[in-house]
Interface confidence: low
């Protein structure tokens, strides 16, 4: 028997520095977790102790903090090279700055193979990107070889900006021939490494003949055997065992997100490359693991540019941006309108001639808006200003919901109106009318939504049975502020871009902003 140790990360999302337990900014260093310096300590410790070790990343290193905003992927290549990753799969967020934003900072700079079997380049891009990413890579490990085959969510064109010259094929259809090719090369130990979410990971394990292990990402799935060490609730045991259609037991793993854990999987293969045992658990990278001093020093050096950036002007406002709780928790506020407009703008994807855009709606809990911005400071808006408005380090995500769920959400928005509670919704692409004289649960008297399948966008009544795409904070997608119906009834959830980054990019693009209160939210009775 031959033993392989797979160390893996996924959905790190720009968390190069250590973070608090909830993966936001580190405040009390003695209780902070993750970060590349701490990760390196643990990886090196395992490399020294065990003979056959692979360090893999399942995508979405890009996007999530000011590190990505400033360094645009150069930081990913630099620190992944320093940690000596063996391979990475492309995630959807790797395309957030377009194909160029992937090629220049990462694909050309990485000293490790970057993989995806189901992304096919066409047209002029085909020759430009040729060889910069691969469908698979055969890696020597000790006296053996291991094949790594990559995959990426086929939803990427709706979630990011890959352009028109990349085709995202069905994962299973694309993977099978590549695995077959590896078999003809006498590679009998094959890992599928990719970024399509836990459901697809399990399907790959079931359907793709010849895949021995699946290392996934995208769904931020936490798996654990035994008592979990932090706040994350396991979605199943680690590894999660899938019985393939040809009767094999295939381990599937994922390691939550944000570099909080290092996935640790030990696989035993027989001489024919069959998995005979698999066990392990994610390792919580808490403060009991010291940060590596050389990597930490490098982080501190790169950090200097970030501090300078956060005080630079992004753009100007010529109006007061009312982010006060007195406004945003009671009525339409122009800060809410600004943020929602930025959220929609960030999701403009012209993927179908019948649709002006794939999504037109935004909802945002008023309680998530934490500060106004005064225009009398020369109109200047900085990253620092925006960090006061959106201090929680969340993301603006894409969900699919039935109209009936949206209706429930808007009823919940005003079910205890008047108590300055955070669930009052700010909106974009939605016109809502409330009648507060009616009983809670029956206060939405009009709910019109902006069409997407139209050349001239206009507002139509919400249809209860129709499925709509909506951009909203991850906090709401996860049922925060009592929006349990969203969490319970959402039909799809894809995590999006860092909230501050979305708004800062929009302001930089617009240069001068003047959001108004324009009748998106109305009250049919009372003095509102």
């Amino acid at each position: 028997a031959w033993e392989l140790t797979i160390l893996h990360t996924n959905d790190v999302h720009s968390r190069l520095e250590q973070t608090s337990e909830d993966s936001s900014k580190c405040v009390n260093a003695s209780r902070c977790m993750g970060g590349v310096a701490r990760l390196f300590t643990k990886v090196q410790q395992i490399r020294r102790a065990e003979p056959n070790v692979l360090l893999l990343d399942a995508g979405d290193q890009y996007q999530g903090t000011i590190w990505f905003t400033v360094y645009k992927g150069a930081e990913v290549a630099h620190f992944m090279n320093a940690l000596r990753y063996d391979a990475m799969a492309l995630g959807n967020h790797e395309f957030d700055n377009g194909v160029e934003g992937l090629i220049e900072p990462l694909l050309k700079e990485a000293k490790f193979p970057i993989l995806s079997a189901n992304i096919k380049a066409k047209g002029p891009l085909a020759s430009q990107i040729s060889g910069l990413y691969l469908p698979y890579k055969v890696l020597p490990v000790g006296d053996e070889v291991v094949g790594i085959v990559g995959y990426t969510s086929k939803e990427t064109p709706f979630l990011s900006n890959p352009g028109t010259n990349l085709v995202f094929e069905d994962e299973i259809t694309a993977l099978q021939p590549e695995v077959d090719k590896l078999k003809t090369l006498n590679v009998n130990k094959i890992i599928a490494l990719g970024h399509s979410g836990f459901e697809m990971d399990k399907l790959i394990a079931q359907k793709v003949r010849g895949v021995d292990v699946v290392v996934g990402g995208h769904s931020n799935t936490f798996l654990y055997t035994g008592n979990p060490p932090s706040k994350e609730v396991p979605a199943g045991k680690y590894p999660f065992i899938v019985t393939s259609d040809d009767g094999r037991k295939v381990p599937v793993v994922q390691a939550y997100a944000f570099g909080k854990y290092l996935g640790y999987l030990k696989i035993e293969f027989d001489e024919r490359g069959n998995v005979i045992s698999s066990h392990g658990n994610p390792i919580l990278l808490n403060s009991s693991i010291p940060e590596d001093p050389s990597i930490k020093a490098d982080i501190n050096k790169w950090r200097i540019k970030l501090d300078n950036y956060s005080t630079q002007e992004l753009g100007k406002t010529i109006v007061y941006l009312d982010g006060s709780s007195q406004s945003c928790r009671f009525r339409e506020c122009n800060m809410g309108n600004l943020i929602c407009d930025a959220m929609i703008n960030n999701n403009l994807r012209h993927t179908d001639e019948m649709f002006w855009n794939h999504v037109s709606m935004c909802i945002l809990n008023g309680g998530g808006i934490r500060s106004p911005i005064d225009e009398r400071n020369n109109g200047t808006i900085t990253w620092e200003n925006l960090a006061a408005v959106l201090p929680f380090g969340g993301t603006f995500d894409l969900v699919q919901l039935k109209g009936s769920t949206l209706k429930k959400a808007f009823e919940h928005s005003v079910h205890r109106y008047g108590q300055s509670t955070g669930e009052f919704l700010q909106v974009g692409g939605i016109h809502v009318v409330y009648d507060l004289s009616r009983k809670p649960g029956d206060r939405v008297v009009k709910l019109d939504v902006l069409c997407t399948k139209c050349r001239v966008p206009s507002y139509d009544p919400l249809k209860m049975d129709e499925v709509y795409k909506v951009i909203l904070p991850n906090f709401l997608a996860n049922g925060g502020d009592g929006f349990q119906m969203i969490k319970d009834e959402l039909l799809r959830h894809d995590s999006g871009d860092q909230d501050i980054n979305v708004v800062s990019t929009y302001i930089s693009k617009m240069k001068v902003i003047y959001p108004a209160v324009e009748g998106r939210i109305k009250f049919s009775t009372g003095s509102h």
């Epitope: 459901e199 079910h415 049922g479 349990q484 319970d488 039909l491």
Partner: antibody, heavy 119, light 106 residues
Framework: QVTLRESGPALVKPTQTLTLTCTFS??????????VGWIRQPPGKALEWLAH???????YYNPSLKSRLTISKDTSKNQVVLTMTNMDPVDTATYYC???????????WGQGTLVTVSS | DIQMTQSPSSLSASVGDRVTITCQAS??????VAWYQQKPGKAPKVLIY???YRYSGVPSRFSGSGSGTDFTFTISSLQPEDIATYYC????????FGQGTKLEIK
Amino acid sequence: QVTLRESGPALVKPTQTLTLTCTFSGFSLSTSGMGVGWIRQPPGKALEWLAHIWWDDDKYYNPSLKSRLTISKDTSKNQVVLTMTNMDPVDTATYYCARRERWAWFAYWGQGTLVTVSS
Amino acid sequence: DIQMTQSPSSLSASVGDRVTITCQASQNVFTNVAWYQQKPGKAPKVLIYSASYRYSGVPSRFSGSGSGTDFTFTISSLQPEDIATYYCQQYNSYPTFGQGTKLEIK
């Protein structure tokens, strides 16, 4: 440990209103994410979800019974109350209260209380 | 509302047998399905949630699978204490249950 106990009348007359109380321990309905629901089961028949209430007083009802049901909570007493108006013999069932988990499945149940509707 | 059609409504099996119960949802419920065991005069007990995850303390002979509209519940080796009625429940929209499968020993 988590326990739930239902209490209320064993017999109600047709057209009357049924009031059931669920008294629980081992968790608090003021904790974010907590919910308690009611499910009933007519003799020899399947289970039917009726209503549930969340920590923040958000309430959900089975649409086919919504007009007859009211759910409320008293956090300080660790109680949830369900009222059902205009009772009919077809409402004869064992009524259970249960703690609703992260999604909408129920891990902890009371032992149930049999309510018979008869004149 | 979403109907859950469970089959068979009753079945008889011997100790050690592999037992399979199926449940079909009237529309896509993704993996939002739970399975319960109910013994006479007792409250139901959850065995499986999210279609395939065993609840803590549930013996490994119980398993679940499926997604979308078709779900399967399996007892790999029937034990005498498994005699009960089993229910599926979807929670993609407001909860609805299957009509139950009564399991008896031959």
